[in-house]
């Protein structure tokens, strides 16, 4: 006759508050005759969790039909789990006896522990923008998880980062834990469209990690390059001068023209275009009247980008005698 084995396959069962826990128990033999009961804890003070034949256990249901002949599955489900339900659960076989049934064999036990899912990771970037080639720090926080074991990874555009530091608090026993990680990211000029991702993996997430993201567009400032050029062709007695402001981010930009140090108030034509990398180009045209102009006209294009110190480019206007003749010819 085969010796009875009580099989409880899970050593640890993580459950979430409010959910249903399934505790597995199978037997390898139908003998001896007698019931299988579920207890939490051991010794005389152990708590009866389920007795099929008598008592009131409204939160407990059986996984299979215990009344079926030759049933060997005594697994149970406990609904509406609360923190009070944690502990080690044992399925115990009793042999029918008189006056009392006699405990025959116990399963090894399944420890039920509360598993709490981590909150969605929140990623925060630096307070101020930084230019490319510099390093910025991003922090990622997630709270309220249990057990303490957790994995956090950082990615930049899908590439895993290695320069980060992570802390899980508290260090001792607790009902819930928090994680905080700080990653150091070197900014590239093309990072306007880049993202950093903080990925959190935890046993309660069943292989589906949580992610928090931050756009590097919030952290980067790409300063513009300036070029001032004079167009070779003139329109009547006017020469067209162009100021090209290239590859800047963010869009916030103020452009002013000065003629021989005097700020010009008149309207100028301009266009804004966005580059594939997310940076912007700004082109401004300035028409200079060359009739009776001296040769020493200096034009300045000054740009104040994102509240930074102004940068400027100057152009000494080249007006040839030929151009002067043309302009005087054009004057009625």
């Amino acid at each position: 006759e085969e010796e009875l084995q009580m099989i409880q396959p899970e050593k640890l069962l993580l459950v979430t508050v409010g959910k249903t826990a399934t505790l597995h128990c199978t037997v390898t033999s139908l003998l001896p005759v007698g019931p299988v009961l579920w207890f939490r804890g051991v010794g005389p003070g152990r708590e009866l969790i389920y007795n099929q034949k008598e008592g009131h256990f409204p939160r407990v249901t059986t996984v299979s039909d215990l009344t079926k002949r030759n049933n060997m599955d005594f697994s149970i489900r406990i609904s509406s789990i609360t923190p009070a339900d944690v502990g080690t659960y044992y399925c115990v076989k009793f042999r029918k006896g008189s006056p009392e049934n006699v405990e025959f064999k116990s399963g090894p036990g399944t420890e039920m522990a509360l598993g709490a899912k981590p909150s969605a990771p929140v990623v925060l970037g630096p307070a101020a923008r930084t230019t490319p080639e510099h390093t910025v720090s991003f922090t990622c926080e997630s709270h309220g998880f249990s057990p303490r074991d957790i994995t956090l990874k950082w990615f930049k555009n899908g590439n895993e980062l290695s320069d980060f530091q992570t802390n899980v608090d508290p260090t001792g026993q607790s009902v819930a834990y928090s994680i905080r990680s700080t990653a150091r990211v070197v900014l590239d000029p093309w990072d306007v469209r880049s993202q950093v991702i903080c990925e959190v993996a935890h046993v309660t997430l069943q292989g589906d990690p949580l992610r928090g993201t931050a756009n590097l567009s919030e952290a980067i400032r790409v300063p513009p390059t300036l070029e001032v050029t004079q167009q070779p062709m003139r329109v009547g007695n006017q020469v067209n001068v162009t100021c090209q402001v290239r590859k800047f981010y963010p869009q916030s930009l103020q452009l002013t023209w000065s003629e021989n140090g005097n700020v010009c108030q008149r309207e100028t034509a301009s266009t804004l275009t966005e580059n594939k990398d997310g940076t912007y180009n700004w082109t401004s045209w300035f028409l200079v009247n060359i009739s009776d102009q001296r040769d020493d006209v200096v034009l300045t294009c000054q740009v104040k980008h994102d509240g930074q110190l102004a940068v400027s480019k100057r152009l000494a206007l080249e007006v040839t005698v030929h151009q002067k003749d043309q302009s005087s010819d054009a004057t009625p």
Epitope: P44, G45, E47, L48, G55, H56, T67, K96, E100
Partner: antibody, heavy 113, light 108 residues
């Protein structure tokens, strides 16, 4: 819905035997212990015994041992309690209950000469 | 056998008052096996509290149960008119199963 319907009131003479039935519906009695409880007029509850209808195993309180027989018929889903050698102090309401949670309405047994 | 002694035998209180009913066992009873029943005249007992402290379905939250070992208590925080009845404690920890003699909760 779980229901336990007991047989009607009985009047018996001392020394006689009474057999009370408890018909169950909404569940199979084979799956539960069926208990019997006595309540004498103006007195408290007293556990008589129980049966496991699955294998007819019984347990009785020492006070009733030898005079009481609890049986069950799983084909009709009915439990029975038979009390013999009746005496006046057996005058009481007898309740059946399923696994200590659901109770029948009670059967009054009057023992009088 | 385990003898359950309930006290007081009768408790006279007014609606709104707090009621404390005690049940003392002659030997230790695991909390899982201590139940309370309510019974009103002419009615069958009703399961009221199971496993020492768990309220049966539909029982108002003003009722609570506590205790361990040999001393158990049923408490009603603020009595309502429908609470006046007889309450029995019951152990099914070992055979023979036993009941306390009951506490009659009556209106003062």
């Amino acid at each position: 819905e779980v229901q336990l319907v007991q047989s009607g009131a009985e009047v018996k003479k001392p020394g006689a035997t009474v057999k009370i039935s408890c018909k169950a519906s909404g569940f199979n009695i084979k799956d539960y212990y069926m208990h019997w409880v006595q309540q004498a007029p103006g007195k408290g509850l007293e556990w008589i015994g129980r049966i496991d209808p699955e294998d007819a195993e019984t347990k009785y309180a020492p006070k009733f041992q030898g005079r009481v027989t609890i049986t069950a018929d799983t084909s009709t889903n009915t439990a029975y309690m038979e009390l013999s050698s009746l005496r006046s102090e057996d005058t009481a309401v007898y309740y059946c209950d399923r696994g200590l949670a659901y109770w029948g309405q009670g059967t009054l047994v009057t023992v009088s000469s | 056998e385990i003898v359950l002694t309930q006290s007081p035998a009768t408790l006279s209180l007014s609606p709104g008052e707090r009621a404390t009913l005690s049940c003392s066992a002659s030997s230790s009873v695991s909390s899982s096996y201590l139940y309370w029943y309510q019974q009103k005249p002419g009615q069958a007992p009703k399961l009221w509290i199971y496993s020492t402290s768990n309220l049966a379905s539909g029982i108002p939250a003003r009722f609570s149960g506590s205790g361990s070992g040999t001393d158990f208590t049923l408490t009603i925080s603020s009595l309502e008119p429908e609470d006046f009845a007889v309450y029995y404690c019951h152990q099914w920890s070992s055979y023979p199963y036993t009941f306390g003699q009951g506490t009659k909760l009556e209106i003062k």
